[in-house]
Structure formats: structure tokens, C-alpha cells
Amino acid sequence: MMTGTIETTGNISAEKGGSIILQCHLSSTTAQVTQVNWEQQDQLLAICNADLGWHISPSFKDRVAPGPGLGLTLQSLTVNDTGEYFCIYHTYPDGTYTGRIFLEVLESSVAEHGARFQIP
């Protein structure tokens, strides 16, 4: 039975040119996390493997930094970075857990940094 839940930073906004931390946390399970994939729509941004550590996709190397923890830091944000991001936890015995974050990159300084809430 899959007992775990993914908590995420939910809907967040940030300023163009700034940076943002995408964070997910798997709780309520003792399942072994073998790997966490970070994806934007259908593009793989990064992988964190329990044994091998981090791998950042070559096309995102300049703007994506691993961490903190299993999270991901996006830098030099552009309006084109607006959209859905997914953290995909590969575990056993439970299987796969997926969390969703929506990032809106704003032109002005009215962006609410660190707005945190969970999407059901």
C-alpha cells in the first residue's frame, strides 16, 4: 500500500532574473527513495540518485543548481520558465510518487517570494 504523501511548495512566483527553490518532501512512509527526477512538462531537468548523487541535464547546467536537499534551485529566471514542475520520487516498495509545483515568473517586483501552500 502506498501510504506516503508528497508535500510541495505549491504555487510560487518569482521575479525575472531572480532565483527560486523548488522543494518537495516525501513523508508518512519508510519506503527507500532510489531516485528523484525533476521535470518541467516533458523535459528532464535533473536527477538525484541515492547512490550516484546529482546529474543536471546538459541544457540546464548553467541555470539549475542541485539542492538544498532533494530540492532544485532555478537561477536567472525568464518568463519562459513559467509553468508546471514535477518532482518524481522513485521508491521501493511503494513505487512512484509525484509532486506538482506551479511557478509563475513575473516581470515586476510584485512577485511573492516563498508563497507556500499545498495543492491537493
Epitope: M1, M2, S27, T30, Q32, A50, D51, Y92, P93, G95
Partner: antibody
Framework: EVQLVESGGGLVQPGGSLRLSCAAS????????MSWVRQAPGKGLEWVSE????????YYPDTVKGRFTISRDNSKNTLYLQMNSLRAEDTAVYYC???????????WGQGTLVTVSS | DVVMTQSPLSLPVTPGEPASISCRSS???????????LEWYLQKPGQSPKLLIY???NRFSGVPDRFSGSGSGTDFTLKISRVEAEDVGVYYC?????????FGGGTKVEIK
């Protein structure tokens, strides 16, 4: 090389307490769920507890629930088992174990003996 | 709780001959994820247990190919194609598809 070294076993009176430690090395401790398994003298293996990599989730069988507490210090690469209200039937060798490759107990320590007797 | 029942309790073997150990679970140990988390361990005298087989039929690294696992649902088997003297010890099956995690009672393999 993965190494797990248990310590803290010994002789304790019924109703007493003991804290076992498992020092881990050779891998990223904070990435792994960890477990304790015990074996009474001349008997089979029994799963005792497990804890998630972050320490936020734990499971126990009914035989030890409410008496044993598993915990970890990821900054010290150490797993713990706090055993309270000990009974004669808790006498056993206690092993810590780590998963790997889709297996739950891929790596084991050498064990530490706990004897509960008056 | 899932009860794991092993047979036989004791298995006298002749070196070079095959051997087989059965493990039955009281209910299906197919996990919701679709995987069957059934493992086999060998505990040699005076040693810690060692993993032989995981997910029913996968040999762990360094395990000789004379060991093989099979089965599905509730019925599982560990086979040793040609027993060697170093294979003596107690063999345990184990499931972690369900909590509590449970071991079989063990099968003692000894040389005739």
C-alpha cells in the same frame, strides 16, 4: 565499502532500558531507510523496526511498539534503538541493516547481544 | 500479518546434488506497485545473515549462479543446483510487501 557496526548491547534487568547504536560508513547514510532485525538465541530472524532516510517516518511490529524507539542522527551517520521496559523475550542479537538494489536488507552489521535477565 | 511458512524445517543434502526450499505466504505478497518483494537470506553458523535473492528471482551481487529463486503470488522456491559444503546454514525467506515485514521460520541445510 558499506560498513555497519552495532554497539551498546549488554546485560540488563527486566523492566530496564538500553540504547543500541549502529555506526554507518562507506555510503551516504542520509539517503537510506534503515532497519533493526533481531535473533533470539537458537531462533529465527525477526524484524524490529525501520526508519525513513529523513527520520520522519517509523514502523514497528506489535511485539515492540510503545517500548522501542528507532531514531537516527544523519550528521553522525548513526542509527539508534532505544529499548525500554525490556522483557526476557527481548534477549537477542540485534542487527542493523540497510537496503540496496531493490532489496530490504542488502547489508548487515555484525550484531550486538542484548541479554535481559535478573 | 503475513505469515511466511518454510519447508522443510531441516534439509540433509549431499554435495553435488540439488536442493530445494519452499516458502508460502498466508496471503499474496504482490505489492500495489506490481512488484513482489520476496527475498532469501542465508545465515552461516556464527555469522550475520547474507542476502542471496531479491524480488523473487534476482541474485544479489557475488551470489553464485547455482542459487536461483522462483515463484509468484503466495508460493516461492529457492533452488541450489549443486550443493557445496559452504552452503550449509539456515535459509530464511522474507517479505516486505506488507507491514509488518515478516520472515519465514528458517530451513537448516546440513551435509549428510
Amino acid at each position: 565499502e558499506v560498513q555497519l557496526v552495532e554497539s551498546g548491547g549488554g546485560l540488563v534487568q527486566p523492566g530496564g532500558s538500553l540504547r543500541l547504536s549502529c555506526a554507518a560508513s562507506g555510503f551516504t547514510f542520509s539517503s537510506y531507510t534503515m532497519s533493526w532485525v533481531r535473533q533470539a538465541p537458537g531462533k529465527g530472524l525477526e524484524w524490529v523496526s525501520e526508519i525513513s532516510s529523513s527520520g520522519g517516518s517509523t514502523y514497528y511490529p506489535d511485539t515492540v511498539k510503545g517500548r522501542f524507539t528507532i531514531s537516527r542522527d544523519n550528521s553522525k551517520n548513526t542509527l539508534y534503538l532505544q529499548m525500554n521496559s525490556l522483557r526476557a523475550e527481548d534477549t537477542a542479537v540485534y542487527y542493523c541493516a540497510r537496503p540496496g538494489l531493490g532489496a530490504w536488507f542488502a547489508y548487515w552489521g555484525q550484531g550486538t547481544l542484548v541479554t535481559v535477565s535478573s | 500479518d503475513v505469515v511466511m511458512t518454510q519447508s522443510p524445517l531441516s534439509l540433509p543434502v549431499t554435495p553435488g546434488e540439488p536442493a530445494s526450499i519452499s516458502c508460502r505466504s498466508s496471503q499474496s505478497i504482490v505489492h500495489n506497485s506490481g512488484n513482489t518483494y520476496l527475498e532469501w537470506y542465508l545465515q552461516k553458523p556464527g555469522q550475520s545473515p547474507k542476502l542471496l535473492i531479491y524480488k523473487v528471482s534476482n541474485r544479489f551481487s557475488g551470489v553464485p549462479d547455482r542459487f536461483s529463486g522462483s515463484g509468484s503470488g503466495t508460493d516461492f522456491t529457492l533452488k541450489i543446483s549443486r550443493v557445496e559444503a559452504e552452503d550449509v546454514g539456515v535459509y530464511y525467506c522474507f517479505q516486505f510487501s506488507h507491514v509488518p515485514r515478516t520472515f519465514g521460520g528458517g530451513t537448516k541445510v546440513e551435509i549428510k
